[in-house]
C-alpha cells in the first residue's frame, strides 16, 4: 500500500486572456472508477476551492456550469484549465485528487503550481 | 465560525438503535467530506466512518461497517450516524470532524457520550 | 491497515521543559499525509500540524513537527501549563483512517 503521488509543474505564465493551464497527473495504486479532482488556491496559509469535478474512469471531467475551470482526463492524467484570472489572482495553485471508488480511499495533493497572471496594459487612445 | 454540534446520544440497551446527528455551520457543507470518529472511556480515537460530498460515496471501519449508516443532508447541512444492533463495545464519545482541503481533520464537535447497557 | 505506535505511554516533564514525542508508522506514509493532535481532558481533539510540519491556523510557534517514511516527530519547545494533555497522531493519506493510541505530557 503506497501513498498516491500527485505531480504539477511549479510554474505557470497565464496568458493576456487570464487563462492559465496545466497538466495534474497522479500515481494511482488502485484501480479507481470514481475520481474527484480540485483545484486549491494557497495564500498566506489560507486555503481556498477554486473548482471541483468528479469523473468516472473513461468518461470526460464535467465541472459545474458557473465554474471557472474547464478539464479533460485521459487516463491518469487531467488537463486543467483556469480562466478569467487577474494579477490579484496570481498565486499557488494545489491539485488533489481523491480516488473515491471502489475502496480503499486514496488522496493525492501536488505541491502547487505557482500561477502568475499579468493584467495586460490598457490599449492607448490612437487619434485618427 | 465553523462549528459543528453533535446530538442525539444516551443510554441505550444492546441490540437496539440509536440516530446521532451533527449540525454544521460556517463553511459550505457540501465542499468537504465529514467523518464520525469515537472515544471509548479513557481509550484513544477511533476512526468510525466518514462520507463524501454528496453523500453517494462513504467509508466504514470493519468494527461498524453493516451495523452503521452515514448520510448527510446537504440542504439542512446535516450529518448523520445511524446505529443498529448497538453492543457494550460502542459505549463511546462521538465527535463529528470536518475533513479540511488539505485532508487532515480540521474541525471537530464538542463530542457527545453514547452509552450501550442492559 | 497502517498501524501507528507512539512512544512514550506517558511523558514527565515540567513546564519550560522540551518535549519530544514519537509516532512509529508500520508502513512508510507519505510525509503530506499525518498530523498531529491535542487533547485536553474534558475536551475534543484539536488538530496542531498537518502534512507533518505545517502548524494549523492559531497553534504557537512552539509546537513543530518532522520526520518522514516511518518515523515521525512531534516537538514543544518549551512546555507552557495548557500544553499538558494527551496527543494523538494520524495518518489520512489512505482508508481507513488510523490514528496512534496516544502520548500523555503530564506534570512531573
Known amino acids: 500500500c503506497k501513498a498516491m503521488h500527485v505531480a504539477q509543474p511549479a510554474v505557470v505564465l497565464a496568458s493576456s486572456r487570464g487563462i492559465a493551464s496545466f497538466v495534474c497527473e497522479y500515481a494511482s495504486p488502485g484501480k479507481a472508477t470514481e475520481v474527484r479532482v480540485t483545484v486549491l488556491r494557497q495564500a498566506d496559509s489560507q486555503v481556498t476551492e477554486v473548482c471541483a469535478a468528479t469523473y468516472m474512469m473513461g468518461n470526460e471531467l464535467t465541472f459545474l456550469d458557473d465554474s471557472i475551470c474547464t478539464g479533460t482526463s485521459s487516463g491518469n492524467q487531467v488537463n486543467l484549465t483556469i480562466q478569467g484570472l487577474r494579477a490579484m489572482d496570481t498565486g499557488l495553485y494545489i491539485c488533489k485528487v481523491e480516488l473515491m471508488y471502489p475502496p480503499p480511499y486514496y488522496l493525492g495533493i501536488g505541491n502547487g503550481t505557482q500561477i502568475y497572471v499579468i493584467d495586460p496594459e490598457p490599449c492607448p487612445d490612437s487619434d485618427f | 465560525q465553523v462549528q459543528l454540534v453533535e446530538s442525539g446520544g444516551g443510554v441505550v440497551q444492546p441490540g437496539r438503535s440509536l440516530r446521532l446527528s451533527c449540525a454544521a455551520s460556517?463553511?459550505?457543507?457540501?465542499?468537504?467530506?465529514i467523518h464520525w470518529v469515537r472515544q471509548a472511556p479513557g481509550k484513544g480515537l477511533e476512526w468510525v466512518a466518514v462520507?463524501?460530498?454528496?453523500?453517494?460515496?462513504?467509508h466504514y471501519a470493519d468494527s461498524v461497517e453493516g451495523r452503521f449508516t452515514i448520510t448527510r443532508d446537504n440542504s439542512n447541512n446535516t450529518l448523520y450516524l445511524q446505529m443498529n444492533s448497538l453492543r457494550a463495545e460502542d459505549t463511546a464519545v462521538y465527535y463529528c470532524?470536518?475533513?479540511?482541503?488539505?485532508?487532515?481533520?480540521?474541525?471537530w464537535g464538542q463530542g457527545i457520550l453514547v452509552t450501550v447497557s442492559s | 491497515e497502517i498501524v501507528l505506535t507512539q512512544s512514550p505511554g506517558t511523558l514527565s516533564l515540567s513546564p519550560g521543559e522540551r518535549a519530544t514525542l514519537s509516532c512509529r508508522a508500520s508502513?512508510?506514509?507519505?510525509?503530506?499525509?499525518l498530523a498531529w493532535y491535542q487533547q485536553r481532558p474534558g475536551q475534543a481533539p484539536r488538530l496542531l500540524i498537518y502534512?507533518?510540519?505545517s502548524r494549523a491556523t492559531g497553534i504557537p510557534d512552539r509546537f513543530s513537527g518532522s520526520g518522514s517514511g516511518t518515523d515521525f516527530t512531534l516537538t514543544i519547545s518549551r512546555l507552557e501549563p495548557e500544553d499538558f494533555a494527551v496527543y494523538y497522531c494520524?495518518?489520512?493519506?489512505?482508508?481507513?483512517?488510523?490514528f496512534g493510541q496516544g502520548t500523555k505530557v503530564e506534570i512531573k
Open positions: 470532524a470536518r475533513q479540511g482541503y488539505m485532508g487532515s481533520l480540521d474541525y
Open positions: 460556517g463553511f459550505t457543507f457540501s465542499n468537504f467530506g
Open positions: 462520507i463524501w460530498y454528496d453523500g453517494r460515496n462513504k
Open positions: 508502513q512508510s506514509v507519505s510525509s503530506s499525509y
Open positions: 502534512g507533518a510540519s
Open positions: 494520524q495518518q489520512y493519506g489512505r482508508s481507513p483512517w488510523t
